[in-house]
């Protein structure tokens, strides 16, 4: 014997209180598959969450984050704050990149400047908190006979300035 509920399409539920007939999902609820005995409550995008896609009878609402935040977790379950370029988000908030490191994005960690001398090159443009160094030609190419290699920036753990 076929289960009568299997005929209920997405957007409906099999109503046990009404001889298992297919009833439409009530407002603010949905069923994304057929044969459901209940409809799920729609997700509400409140606070720092904003609605990316409205809930329908067959699919849940989708949220993203308001400006100044970005999504984390499955289905944007969390909103993490953006930082400025030249900063990284730590457990204690946004902190400036320490000397010798940079971050050119609003998220992620500060990364060490490129060590030009490892490739036998010189520093053409100094690094900043927001930008990596720009490596130029090798010192030998610039002035034959001279070897004024720019010393590399000290390697530190990204972002953690010594106390």
């Amino acid at each position: 014997l076929q289960d009568p509920c299997s005929n209920c399409p997405a957007g409906t539920f099999c109503d046990n209180n009404r001889n298992q007939i297919c009833s439409p999902c009530p407002p603010n609820s949905f069923s994304s598959a057929g044969g459901q005995r209940t409809c799920d409550i729609c997700r509400q995008c409140k606070g720092v969450f904003r609605t990316r896609k409205e809930c329908s009878s067959t699919s849940n609402a989708e949220c993203d984050c308001t400006p100044g935040f970005h999504c984390l977790g499955a289905g944007c379950s969390m909103c993490e704050q953006d930082c400025k370029q030249g900063q990284e988000l730590t457990k204690k908030g946004c902190k400036d990149c320490c000397f010798g490191t940079f971050n050119d994005q609003k998220r992620g960690i500060c990364r060490p400047w490129t060590n030009c001398s490892l490739d036998g090159k010189s520093v053409l443009v100094n690094g900043t908190k927001e930008r990596d160094v720009v490596c130029g030609p090798s010192p030998a190419d610039l002035s034959p006979g001279a070897s004024s290699v720019t010393p590399p920036a000290p390697a530190r753990e990204p972002g953690h300035s010594p106390q």
Epitope: L89, T90, K91, K92, I109, G159, H160
Partner: nanobody, 124 residues
Framework: EVQLLESGGGLVQPGGSLRLSCAAS????????MSWVRQAPEKGLEWVSS????????FYADSVKGRFTISRDNSKNTLYLQMNSLRAEDTAVYFC?????????????????WGQGTTVTVSS
């Protein structure tokens, strides 16, 4: 598949207590530090506490220090957060998070997997 499942949230009066649990699966639990983070209704994510893989090192946000205690039972693959002297400002969705290494600190965000969260409401 790495999974984290939080439980223990609910409605509690100011000054009350709750104990949150996070059941972990799909990875070697004792090899990774774990954290609790929370998201209040109108705010971004806030770090609450972290614990090393062995449980030997713990760290807390200033806002919860002395009130919350993080712990873990590696034999049960479970992380805990004991919350005492709860305040209205502790109202939030609490997420447990796996970190990317065995050790942790109170500086670097190193979380790579999160649970779906459990809601804590502190209200009279």
């Amino acid at each position: 598949e790495v999974q984290l499942l939080e439980s223990g949230g609910g409605l509690v009066q100011p000054g009350g207590s709750l104990r949150l649990s996070c059941a972990a699966s799909g990875f070697t639990f004792s090899s990774y530090a774990m954290s609790w983070v929370r998201q209040a209704p109108e705010k971004g994510l806030e770090w609450v506490s972290s614990i090393s893989g062995s449980g030997g090192s713990t760290f807390y946000a200033d806002s919860v220090k002395g009130r919350f205690t993080i712990s873990r039972d590696n034999s049960k693959n479970t992380l805990y957060l004991q919350m005492n002297s709860l305040r209205a400002e502790d109202t939030a969705v609490y997420f447990c998070a796996k970190e990317g290494a065995t050790e942790t600190d109170d500086y670097h965000f190193n979380t790579d997997v999160w649970g779906q969260g459990t809601t804590v409401t502190v209200s009279s």
